[in-house]
Interface confidence: medium
């Protein structure tokens, strides 16, 4: 099974404000898996609906 994402490189250790960084292999870009209660490209916004 080929993974579609890897851990982010060291340069992205601070990429996600409230979440975990994953690097999307096929799209060659970082993405964030947000912690509960946060939204946004970098989990930078508190989700007021959570």
């Amino acid at each position: 099974v080929v993974s579609h994402f890897n851990d982010c490189p060291d340069s992205h250790t601070q990429f996600c404000f409230h979440g975990t960084c994953r690097f999307l292999v096929q799209e060659d870009k970082p993405a964030c898996v947000c912690a509960s209660g946060y939204v946004g490209a970098r989990c930078e916004h508190a989700d007021l609906l959570a």
């Epitope: 340069s11 992205h12 250790t13 990429f15 799209e27 993405a31 939204v39 490209a41 970098r42």
Partner: antibody, heavy 116, light 107 residues
């Protein structure tokens, strides 16, 4: 992806500025859609975005005056800036970013002059 | 807001020279630093992302380096078409902020 700004070109102090960014070749229900302006003297300022989901972020320096909205049926998004002054004279750009940060597609820009 | 300071404000070089443009942040941006080029009457173009990652379609003579608060854009063997204004952008702390730009003039 192609982006094209449109707007009035000229406004008077205290008026409301409304700009449109028309996007072709890509759906605005993906990624982040930004407004950036360039002042005379070449300073660039990030204004804010509307995201794939419709959520928005506004630069706190503009927060009381700015609104970014969209119409997904037209694949357009909009900038509204209230109570403009001569300090808002600038070239306004719309730009796409996949993550809210890297602006990899830009419109050609539309120039706004605020003058009485 | 993070203040981005670029130097020099203007740089005048002859074709074939190698130049270095500096960008300094008022606090650590953890390599969340991007470089743009804007030619006269043109639209800004992304050259380098995340301090050193190359962009598809951008000539290899453009390279980025740095970390923390200090970053450099290097242009190897400058060409006349490289004339324009170069901006750095920090993408670590919202609101994102740009440097004041370095104007590159080709003699």
């Amino acid at each position: 992806v192609q982006l094209q700004e449109s707007g009035p070109g000229l406004a008077k102090p205290s008026q409301t500025l409304s700009l449109t960014c028309s996007v072709t070749g890509y759906s605005i229900t993906s990624d982040y859609w930004n407004w950036i302006r360039k002042f005379p003297g070449n300073k660039l300022e990030y204004m804010g975005y509307i995201s794939y989901s419709g959520s928005t972020y506004y630069n706190p320096s503009l927060k009381s005056r700015i609104s970014i909205t969209r119409d997904t049926s037209k694949n357009q998004y909009y900038l509204q800036l209230n109570s403009v002054t001569t300090e808002d004279t600038a070239t306004y750009y719309c730009a796409r970013s996949y993550d809210g940060i890297c602006f990899d597609n830009w419109g050609q820009g539309t120039t706004l002059t605020v003058s009485s | 807001d993070i203040l981005m300071t670029q130097s020099p404000a203007t740089l005048s070089v002859t074709p074939g020279e190698t130049v270095s443009l500096s960008c300094r942040a008022s606090q650590n941006t953890y390599k969340n630093l991007h470089w743009y080029q804007q030619k006269s009457h043109g639209t800004p173009k992304l050259l380098i992302k995340y301090a050193s990652a190359p962009i598809s379609g951008i000539p290899s003579r453009f390279t980025g380096s740095g970390s923390g608060t200090d970053y450099t854009l290097s242009i190897n063997s400058v060409k006349p078409e490289d004339e324009g204004i170069y901006y750095c952008l920090q993408g670590y702390s919202m609101p994102w902020t740009f440097g004041g730009g370095t104007k590159l003039e080709i003699k």
